[in-house]
């Protein structure tokens, strides 16, 4: 955690770092470690990648324990093989308007991600890509035989875009806030970020919050009922304390997590809220971090690693964040 103790390095020599990740001396000058990357958690011992102009942003002077790797002010962004200047806006595709800010890209949808529930007029709603149209549109498959109305199919469930409009006009400032990014980890503690100018000076700034989609140790597939393919929001039996680099949350939380599917779908946060969580460290220091809390999850086929560089990320975003 800190550098007060003697140097203790893992027995094996230098670790093997993934491609593009620097091998650096830890912050104590003791051991060689793989540098933390943009948006990852960092500590004095776990430094950020200096070759990418990253530094460990502890958020406030009071908290010197755990930070987030952040690009220095004005750092450019590399997105889809193109370099964008900090402050530059661009359309990643016809579907998304993006902004680069100090090495982080925040994007907002240009297409509606509305849902449609079945009705007599549209018993089998589907979203489809129509020729010559950028955004998918709803089509209503009529039943083959109009006299036989079978059970309505489940509505096409994308994550929703409800809650306050992210674009507001306020005193000569067009307030824009991107959606929270997907959690950087599919299990365990990760980071979620967004870009906003919703502040007194109307300046773009990055915000980050801790997030946990599900605990890594939970074997959720065991809980899927016979005949079912998914467990969307598994019941958490007991309140838990969150752990963050050796520090433990002061309070216990009956948090909701997202489940899993056995049919290739992935379950991701659907509606979330952001709340402050206090962590107490072994040396007695207390620090406050914003954290994502899940209200509902959705299971869908738009899983990480799908074709579109941004779309697979976008569909895993947390919408409708409720304060």
């Amino acid at each position: 955690q800190n550098c007060s103790g003697p140097c203790r390095c893992p027995a094996e020599q230098a670790p093997r770092c993934p491609a593009g990740v620097s091998l650096v001396l830890d912050g104590c000058g003791c051991c060689r470690v793989c540098a933390k990357q943009l948006g990852e958690l960092c500590t004095e011992r776990d430094p950020c990648d200096p070759h990418k102009g990253l530094f460990c942003d502890f958020g406030s002077p009071a908290n010197r324990k755990i930070g987030v790797c952040t690009a220095k002010d004005g750092a450019p962004c590399i997105f889809g093989g193109t370099v964008y200047r900090s402050g530059e806006s661009f359309q990643s595709s016809c579907k998304y308007q993006c902004t680069c800010l100090d090495g982080a890209v925040g994007c907002m949808p240009l297409c509606s991600m509305d849902v449609r529930l079945p009705s007599p007029d549209c018993p089998f709603p589907r979203r489809v890509k129509l020729p010559g149209k950028c955004c998918e549109e709803w089509v209503c498959d009529e039943p083959k035989d109009q006299t036989v109305v079978g059970p309505a199919l489940a509505a096409y469930r994308l994550e929703d875009t409800f809650g306050p409009d992210p674009t507001m006009i306020r005193a000569n400032c067009l307030v824009q806030t991107t959606e929270w990014s997907a959690c950087s980890k599919t299990c365990g503690m990760g980071i979620s970020t967004r870009v906003t100018n919703d502040n007194a000076s109307c300046r773009l700034e990055k915000q980050s919050r801790l997030c946990m989609v599900r605990p890594c140790e939970a074997d959720l597939e065991e809980n899927i009922k016979k005949g079912k393919k998914c467990i969307r929001t598994p019941k958490i039996s007991k309140p838990i304390k969150f752990e963050l680099s050796g520090c433990t949350s002061v309070k216990t939380y009956r948090a909701k997590f997202c489940g899993v599917c056995t049919d290739g779908r992935c379950c991701t946060p659907h509606r979330t809220t952001t709340l402050p969580v206090e962590f107490k460290c072994p040396d007695g220091e207390v620090m406050k971090k914003n954290m994502m809390f899940i209200k509902t999850c959705a299971c869908h086929y738009n899983c990480p690693g799908d074709n579109d560089i941004f779309e697979s990320l976008y569909y895993r975003k947390m919408y409708g964040d409720m304060a």
């Epitope: 009705s119 007599p120 007029d121 709803w138 109305v149």
Partner: antibody, heavy 114, light 110 residues
Framework: EVQLQESGPGLVKPSQTLSLTCTVS????????VHWIRQHPGKGLEWLGV???????DYNAAFMSRLTISKDTSKNQVSFKLSSVTAADTAVYYC????????WGQGTTVTVSS | ETVVTQEPSLTVSPGGTVTLTCRSS?????????ANWVQQKPGQAFRGLIG???NRAPWTPARFSGSLLGGKAALTLSGVQPEDEAEYYC?????????FGGGTKLTVLG
Amino acid sequence: EVQLQESGPGLVKPSQTLSLTCTVSGFSISTFGVHWIRQHPGKGLEWLGVIWRRGGTDYNAAFMSRLTISKDTSKNQVSFKLSSVTAADTAVYYCARDGGFDYWGQGTTVTVSS
Amino acid sequence: ETVVTQEPSLTVSPGGTVTLTCRSSIGAVTTSNYANWVQQKPGQAFRGLIGGTSNRAPWTPARFSGSLLGGKAALTLSGVQPEDEAEYYCALWYSTHYVFGGGTKLTVLG
């Protein structure tokens, strides 16, 4: 963001025609139908009629003779006309989107009185 | 005239389970009635919770589930929260028109 907004006169004289407009944003009325529902003070909901995405209409049989629902797709607006109104038509009138009645307007209060 | 009947009021304790039902006067409710459930909280606008018998709207928590139960449409709330206190209306489709039920006032104790 999906929104529906009802507008029209708050006061209508008996025997006249009540005209309301539902202005829609965040979705297209050529993709979703729009329903009209009313609620008498302290009472439940009463379904009045619907204009479907393709322009067809269905009405509550009790209002068939005096209700007309139409739409202007270019303006994304649905209009509601109820003729020969009486005091019994005093209510809060709502428009709601088809598909689970998922989105509703805030409602507009209509009083029928001379 | 078709009548759709709901329990006028129900009371439940936080964390409990409650089932609201929607009965049709002309026979069993089926999937072709496209049962819808609409919620109104005090001082708030109406919003749809369930459409097409069992499909949840995106904002509808997983503790709400729609089904057909003994020839009636049913809305089951498991693990009831204080914020679930509201008026709930069902609406059934009859080939050419919808009919709303009289509504159920759900009270959450505590």
